[in-house]
């Protein structure tokens, strides 16, 4: 008789990452009988919500439902109907909403209320929408990449099943860059974490981890650019800002009111004799780099060593996965290869930033001009942040791996968040069963 496959006994979970510049919906799937095994959860779908981040809907909260419709419908299509009611849905909002909450707790609550109402209309098991802390964002990103890299598995293997695997159980550090914040998370080597705010203790699969993490609010790539513009316009002699972080020939008018809209530029705010100014690109990597360094206060450190702005940072240890905008920007610039040295990256950035704007527009006709115009800044910012901010060197650069996906799942905080909320990472190592359940009869 022919063997017949039993219906798959699988579970699904949905996490929405409500970031500062956009929202993404992730659908995860795992075998029901292997919930506590490491590495069994994988991403089956990413749906990028069409439009900006949810914080932009503050003046039109009643439209958040429309904005979310398409991706929620996608989830309805991908997940079998019989599973809808038991599929948990979580929404985590990050730094864009942290900034909105700093401006007005009431407005942030109103946005989240409407998000909750909209998501409750779907047939899934909605578990809530909340603004996650920067510490959580860092921690869950670290859990995600190490879970996907198989670092929590106690079984040693003679073969590598995932890229970057070094066949030891040493965890990877996590470097996450968003639009409004950036996170650094890793296990320091025998180093006490001098600042309690930056210390996390985990027991995962029977092993203890002492983890360092920090989230730098306002140091995501978009908010860092606003900071830089606000800083530079202070010393401009008129309403023309000659900016080395934009390509030669690039021109853009900026409203001063937009510049000072974000809490991130408050420290640079001043009364200017004009309502608008014009950015004129001059495309000079070195000058751009110098301007960016002025955003990092390295003159004050109350600890044995700091990143910047007086924030404790232990000596870097081991390999790091750099994901989210670290990956997207470097991928665009074609700089994600393991073989590209830091010197080579710097060299390529010098060339890229110096290219005339008209030439860049022709070469990348399919890219929206707003995004395209900012790659010179973003690439330079990534180098500045990693080298001067986090103290990577030309030698330790090779320990940074720019990662988009691992085993088909996006690197980011969402998987770690779901694993935690569904209790799928046990503190103790699960007892291994002698035989796996057969799917055939």
């Amino acid at each position: 008789t022919q063997n017949k496959a039993l219906p798959e006994n699988v579970k699904y979970g949905i996490v929405l990452d409500a970031g500062s510049s956009h929202t993404s919906l992730y659908i995860y799937k795992w075998p029901a009988e292997k919930e506590n095994d490491t590495g069994v959860v994988h991403q089956v779908e990413e749906c990028r919500v069409k439009g900006p981040g949810i914080s932009k809907f503050v003046q039109k909260v009643n439209e958040i439902g429309i904005y979310l419709t398409d991706c929620m419908e996608r989830a309805r299509e991908v997940i079998p109907r019989s599973q809808h009611q038991e599929t948990p849905v979580y929404l985590g909002a990050t730094a864009g909403m942290r900034l909105l909450r700093m401006e007005s707790e009431e407005l942030a609550d109103r946005v989240l209320d409407v998000v909750e109402r909209s998501l409750s209309n779907y047939p899934f098991d909605f578990q809530g929408a909340r603004i996650i802390t920067g510490q959580e964002e860092g921690a869950y990103g670290w859990i995600t990449i190490n879970y996907l890299l198989g670092k929590f598995s106690q079984k040693t293997r003679w073969f590598s099943i995932v890229p970057y695997e070094t066949n030891n159980q040493e965890t990877f550090g996590a470097l996450d860059l968003g639009g409004a914040s950036t996170q650094v998370t890793f296990v320091p080597q025998n180093q006490t974490i001098e600042s309690p705010d930056n210390a996390l203790q985990f027991r995962l699969y029977g092993k203890d981890y002492n983890v360092y993490t920090h989230s730098f609010l306002c140091y995501g790539k978009d908010q860092a650019l606003w900071q830089k513009l606000a800083k530079d316009i202070q010393v401009a002699s008129n309403e023309i800002l000659r900016d080395p972080c934009f390509h030669p020939g690039y021109k853009k008018v900026v409203n001063v009111s937009d510049l000072y809209k974000t809490p991130c530029t408050k420290r640079f705010e001043m009364t200017l004799p004009f309502q608008q100014f014009e950015i004129q690109g001059i495309g000079n990597y070195q000058q751009c780099h110098q301007s960016i360094l002025e955003l990092f206060n390295t003159s004050y450190c109350p600890y044995s060593q700091c990143a910047f702005n007086g924030i404790f940072l232990p000596p870097l240890q081991g390999d790091f996965g750099a994901f989210s905008a670290f990956y997207f920007v470097m991928k665009f610039l074609n700089l994600t290869s393991e073989k590209v040295s830091q010197e080579k990256v710097t060299e390529m950035m010098k060339k890229f930033c110096a290219q005339p704007w008209e030439e860049i527009k022709t070469s990348y006709a399919g890219v929206k001009e707003k995004y395209l115009s900012e790659y010179c800044f973003s690439g330079t910012y990534i180098l500045s942040l990693l080298l001067q901010g986090y103290h990577f060197t030309a030698d330790s650069w090779e320990h940074i791996h720019f990662i988009g996906k691992i085993q088909g799942s996006d690197a980011g905080w969402t998987l770690g968040y779901m694993l935690n909320l569904t209790n799928m990472i046990p503190a103790e190592q699960p007892l291994s069963t002698p035989l796996s359940h057969s799917t055939y009869v």
């Epitope: 779908e45 990413e46 749906c47 990028r48 069409k50 439009g51 900006p52 932009k56 809907f57 003046q59 039109k60 009643n62 439209e63 439902g65 429309i66 904005y67 419709t69 398409d70 419908e73 996608r74 309805r76 299509e77 209309n121 399919g366 890219v367 929206k368 707003k370 995004y371």
Partner: antibody, heavy 121, light 106 residues
């Protein structure tokens, strides 16, 4: 500003295959779903399907599934719709369009000028 | 699929008159969108998300409704408003349009 430029009118014989195109400019191609809509002469609008250039995923109205295929070429910011085994019932204006929220959360909805397809022996 | 039924099919209002167009859905939808189409032209978004006027649409137009019943109202009909109006739901796939209401000159 967003622009959608469709290929010109087509006159084909029954049973033939045709591929109409929609070239978009003024926005990042992967940011929005691209939809196709059919309108026979003097009749109503019917949604055919769409494609998400970000993921490459497609959705179709069951009525059009099978004979109609939506694809994209990201390198030239162009979406295509191929129609196979054509009959006189396929004579219509075909529109491409996209909608959604821009960076400032303003809703927009843009359509191409339409491609007239005539199926006649 | 969600079937949208528009009524009336044809209406012949006089300029200055108040006009109400209806759109009924076979099952509940979250929002309704309305389009105007003139001969030889592509449809143009007129009202989105039930009650929001699209960019450049005159304030004499308004939209309302919820669940399965939606309306588009013109407070004072003007000559440029003669056209076909379609409702559309984007709440679930497949996306569907109503069969249209034609506003024609008497």
């Amino acid at each position: 500003e967003v622009q959608l430029l469709q290929s010109g009118p087509e006159v084909v014989k029954p049973g033939a295959t045709v591929k109409i195109s929609c070239k978009v400019s003024g926005y990042s191609f992967t940011d929005y779903n691209l939809n196709w809509v059919k309108q026979p002469p003097g009749k109503n609008l019917e949604w055919i399907g769409n494609i998400d250039p970000y993921s490459g995923g497609t959705r179709y109205n069951q009525k059009f599934k099978g004979r109609f295929t939506i694809t994209i070429d990201q390198s030239i910011n162009t979406a295509y719709m191929e129609l196979r085994s054509l009959t006189s019932e396929d004579t219509a204006v075909y529109y491409c369009g996209l909608y959604g929220y821009d960076d400032d959360a303003n809703y927009f909805d843009d359509w191409g000028q339409g491609t007239m397809l005539t199926v006649s022996s | 699929e969600i079937v949208l039924t528009q009524s009336p099919a044809i209406l012949s209002p006089s300029p200055g008159e108040r006009v109400t167009l209806n759109c009924s859905a076979s099952s509940s939808v979250s929002y309704m969108h309305w389009f105007q189409q003139k001969p030889g032209q592509a449809p143009r978004l007129w009202i989105y998300a039930t009650s929001n006027l699209a960019s450049g649409i005159p304030a004499r137009f308004s939209g309302s409704g919820s669940g399965t019943e939606y309306t588009l109202t013109i407070s004072r009909m003007e000559s440029e408003d003669f056209a076909v109006y379609y409702c559309q739901q984007r709440s679930s796939y497949p996306l569907t349009f109503g069969q249209g209401t034609k506003l024609e000159i008497k």
